[in-house]
Interface confidence: low
Amino acid sequence: TGADTEAVVCVGTACYTAHSGKLSAAEAQNHCNQNGGNLATVKSKEEAQHVQRVLAQLLRREAALTARMSKFWIGLQREKGKCLDPSLPLKGFSWVGGGEDTPYSNWHKELRNSCISKRCVSLLLDLSQPLLPSRLPKWSEGPCGSPGSPGSNIEGFVCKFSFKGMCRPLALGGPGQVTYTTPFQTTSSSLEAVPFASAANVACGEGDKDETQSHYFLCKEKAPDVFDWGSSGPLCVSPKYGCNFNNGGCHQDCFEGGDGSFLCGCRPGFRLLDDLVTCASRNPCSSSPCRGGATCVLGPHGKNYTCRCPQGYQLDSSQLDCVDVDECQDSPCAQECVNTPGGFRCECWVGYEPGGPGEGACQDVDECALGRSPCAQGCTNTDGSFHCSCEEGYVLAGEDGTQCQDVDECVGPGGPLCDSLCFNTQGSFHCGCLPGWVLAPNGVSCTMGPVSLGPPSGPPDEEDKGEKEGSTVPRAATASPTRGPEGTPKATPTTSRPSLSSDAPITSAPLKMLAPSGSPGVWREPSIHHATAASGPQEPAGGDSSVATQNNDGTDGQK
């Protein structure tokens, strides 16, 4: 399944596109990547509003949506093995295109701690509510979907494309149509800002007439941080309309000549740029020439300017842009150093947490601490990790190796441990005998007892139960029911499998063990040799953060 087009919003130095289509997070990221972008970041309330706007645009085009909730992937993910960090706004998640741990977040609900599998974030839209600025989409984390499996994927995704700069939309001074083609392969006739390297096709005229003229322009970087189309004067001008059509395409003032011609002009304090349409402030700082957080400082007599950087930044070679000083070069941290804009922060490897002597020190996380253990039974802390173990009669299970599952001794690799009936219990097993036989003291073999038509003998007393390792006592030499009495052929099993709880007495209906008087006795035995109780503890399936449904290959609870 592919992604359908798409809505687009361009603002500042970025464009956001929204797409519908059931894709996994990886497929969505790949789609954005093919056109030079990434799944969108939502690093501030302002950016959340831009993303909401593009989603509103997309949803406006979609046919009526009947699902109450709709989800759209964004570029926030947490890799397998990386645990939740409740102290951070992003909770240990990070943006796919890289970048620092941003302060803005808008989680839908408290996150469940799970390090087992990769988790991805989508924007959750409540389609039953009007999409208003005061209701920004919430962040929902969950499984990342699986390629080629639409049922497990969500409704769409949002991409972000970043640019050096933007051109103003072309202004038409008369009837016509502009079509912009962006570097990320979107065409649109209405962009509030047009990204660098976009092409514009202008078709002048009323549309139904033959006298249409076409123009082609490219959004170029004319000077550092100055982007324009290289056009001069308003486009599609017509004496018929003069200044009456779209203010003649002028940015500020439009002055009409007597012959229907007109000129664009600017208000006091502004000057007309080379395109003869746009007005810019005469103050050199008003065009915001300084980038990357630099402050524009006016020179003497207001003629020129210099850019000044905040602490932790320095000017780059262009003297316009601030670049971050990399404090991590000096290795200030014990384990990991993350350079952030204007500073740095120390991080600890998975399995460690901040602490210990000195700035940026790390100490081992005791995953086995009380109330914290991820293991169902035994937990052993190791330096930077942990491992789980199980009590006798259980083996490690679960995709992450933290659960314990009962061993069914009745179907062990060496065959049944009991001579006759075998009953599996949680963490153990016990043997039983058919009517007319009694359990030998070793708790495994059966010896011939007084003939009886009663039910099979019940579970042995606690001290007679089979040992977990299997009894070392040799089996009794007496005939045992699984082999049948000497000289009688084994009959086809006919009784149903007993379904017994661990300590329930055997109360199945009496088995008719002997044929009518005078004919040789025929032994019948249960068709399934053992009664298996429910398997070991299992994680309940739950909300969208349930680990139980993840497809992981983690085996032993490693972080």
């Epitope: 603002v11 831009h50 509103a56 009526a64 009947t66 109450r68 509510q129 208003l132 600025p133 005061s134």
Partner: antibody
Framework: QVQLVQSGAEVKKPGASVKVSCRAS????????IHWVRQAPGQGLEWIGE????????YYNQKFKGRVTMTRDKSSSTVYMELSSLTSEDSAVYYC?????????????WGAGTTVTVSS | DIVMTQSPDSLAVSLGERATINCKAS??????????LNWYQQKPGQPPKLLIY???NLESGVPDRFSGSGSGTDFTLTISSLQAEDVAVYYC?????????FGGGTKVEIK
């Protein structure tokens, strides 16, 4: 062409309920929200609430919550607005209007209005 | 609730002259670059009719003598050359927050 056709005028006693209908035609009924707006004699416009006709989601002005119920019948492309516990203050012309599905939900098509008079 | 205040309450303008109506919101109705502010015209005995949406976008079929401007909290509807058929009450409306609210209306008459 796109039209919203409303039911006829109603006269009600205080404490009673009134149910006004609005039938849509000329466009895909489920692709637009339907809003209700009222206008008391000589007064301005007051938004009552909206309904999404596809899945019947509703959103009401808090002022009317508990008294207003909006419903729809997809088969006849009709939306209903019921207002209960009427008082003389509820005497007004009630308009239905449609808006786009998302974003700036301006009202681009209006019904002609239904006059509701509440009098003992 | 966002309160929308229109001024003046009524306006008398000569035919062919410019008419200007103001609308002030009690808080900003801008959102991510768009103004969630719409203008309607209502003639006696008729429902309102959409003129301008998102502060400055002319609804299709509306004469281009109508124009809208403004952002944040202050908005203006301008009729560049008043015609006899423009006699009506004009309302502004915000759709940025619930409940959607209207201004009190401005009555435009011919002088």
């Amino acid at each position: 062409q796109v039209q919203l056709v409303q039911s006829g005028a109603e006269v009600k006693k205080p404490g009673a309920s009134v149910k006004v209908s609005c039938r849509a035609s000329g466009y895909t009924f489920t692709s637009y929200w339907i809003h209700w707006v009222r206008q008391a004699p000589g007064q301005g416009l007051e938004w009552i609430g909206e309904i999404e006709p596809s899945a019947s989601y509703t959103y009401y002005n808090q002022k009317f919550k508990g008294r207003v119920t909006m419903t729809r019948d997809k088969s006849s492309s009709t939306v209903y607005m019921e207002l209960s516990s009427l008082t003389s203050e509820d005497s007004a012309v009630y308009y239905c209007a449609r808006s786009v599905y998302y974003g700036n939900k301006y009202f681009d098509v209006w019904g002609a209005g239904t006059t509701v008079t509440v009098s003992s | 609730d966002i309160v929308m205040t229109q001024s003046p309450d009524s306006l008398a303008v000569s035919l062919g002259e410019r008419a200007t109506i103001n609308c002030k919101a009690s808080q900003s109705v801008d959102y991510a670059g768009d103004s969630y502010l719409n203008w309607y015209q209502q003639k006696p005995g008729q429902p309102p009719k959409l003129l301008i949406y998102a502060a400055s976008n002319l609804e299709s079929g509306v004469p281009d003598r109508f124009s809208g401007s403004g952002s944040g909290t202050d908005f203006t509807l301008t009729i560049s050359s008043l015609q006899a058929e423009d006699v009506a009450v004009y309302y502004c409306q915000q759709t940025n927050e619930d409940p959607r609210t209207f201004g009190g209306g401005t009555k435009v008459e011919i002088k």
